[in-house]
């Protein structure tokens, strides 16, 4: 039975040209995290494998940095980066957990971080 929950940074906003950290955290389970995939809609951004380390998609390697931890740092943000991001946790023995983050990239300097929230 899957008992875990994914906590994410929730709805966040950032300035064009700036950077943002996408972060998820798996809690309420003793399952072992074997791999975390980061995706934007259906596009793979990066993989963090517990044994193999990071794979950053070549299309994003110039502006995506691994970490901190299992998170992902997006740099040189553009308005086109606005949208949904997903952290997909592969765990043993539970299986797969998915968290969602919505990022809005703003032209002006009024970007503020949204509140953290949980996805069961």
């Amino acid at each position: 039975m899957m008992t875990g929950t994914i906590e994410t940074t929730g709805n966040i906003s950032a300035e064009k040209g700036g950077s943002i950290i996408l972060q998820c955290h798996l809690s309420s389970t003793t399952a072992q995290v074997t791999q975390v995939n980061w995706e934007q809609q259906d596009q793979l951004l990066a993989i963090c494998n517990a044994d193999l380390g990071w794979h950053i998609s070549p299309s994003f390697k110039d502006r995506v940095a691994p970490g901190p931890g299992l998170g992902l740092t997006l740099q040189s943000l553009t308005v086109n980066d606005t949208g949904e991001y997903f952290c997909i946790y592969h765990t043993y023995p539970d299986g797969t957990y998915t968290g969602r983050i919505f990022l809005e990239v703003l032209e002006s300097s009024v970007a503020e971080h949204g509140a953290r929230f949980q996805i069961p």
């Epitope: 074997t34 793979l44 517990a50 794979h55 390697k61």
Partner: antibody
């Protein structure tokens, strides 16, 4: 066109070391991780390790960890695999292979370098 | 280490035949499986990754399926250039491991 061109065949004595090179062209070298895989005569493929040419960070198969070193020369778009303390069981074809877009598989392979270990 | 087995180890087939190769994995690897084709004296060539995604330039007669621990590579209509050895590989953990191969030769 993506190309991985490896150095020529080597004959080594037991206990010696070998360093195989892999020159990449046709793509941005630092954007793609590089793997090294070997194949002994009549055997299955055996993964040795991978490297991020951008950072130089590497991961190895535990079986080879004490004997293998994978490095890169970014300016020459070249990856290297050095295997030390050679024994007869290391006789194999050694391949470099570029990591794919979507994970830890390999989408392009070098032509292979035959390493023969014999006294 | 994750163990990979393939069946059959070899098979004889004719041009036009439908060929199916199976790969079994010792633990759940989700869909992180690749298939390669290798001809004698040549380097492996990627056919499929993520269990079912065809690599660039690979003919549509090749298809992959499966998830978890059981995977299949199918050649819908065998062509003369398809006679080769086929290897599966998981791309999920360290070490990455390959199956022992399935040799497809002419009947």
């Amino acid at each position: 066109e993506v190309q991985l061109v490896q150095s020529g065949a080597e004959v080594k004595k037991p206990g010696a070391s070998v360093k195989v090179s892999c020159k990449a062209s046709g793509y941005t070298f630092t954007n793609y991780y590089m793997h090294w895989v070997r194949q002994a005569p009549g055997q299955r493929l055996e993964w040795m390790g991978r490297i991020d040419p951008d950072s130089g960070g590497s991961k190895y198969n535990e079986k080879f960890k004490s004997r293998v070193t994978i490095t890169v020369d970014k300016s020459a778009s070249t990856a290297y695999m050095e295997l030390s303390s050679l024994r007869s069981e290391d006789t194999a074809v050694y391949y470099c292979a570029r990591e794919g877009h979507y994970g830890f598989y390999s989408d392009y392979w070098g032509q292979g370098t035959t390493v023969t270990v014999s006294s | 280490d994750i163990q990979m087995t393939q069946s059959p180890s070899s098979l004889s087939a004719s041009v036009g035949d439908r060929v199916t190769i199976t790969c079994r994995v010792s633990e759940n690897i989700y869909s992180y499986l690749a298939w390669y084709q290798q001809k004698p004296g040549k380097s492996p060539k990627l056919l499929v990754y993520n269990a079912k995604t065809l690599a660039e330039g690979v003919p549509s007669r090749f298809s992959g399926s499966g998830s978890g621990t059981d995977f299949t590579l199918t050649i819908s209509s065998l062509q003369p250039e398809d006679f080769a050895t086929y290897y599966c590989q998981h791309h999920y953990g360290n070490p990455l491991t390959f199956g022992p191969g399935t040799k497809v030769d002419i009947k």
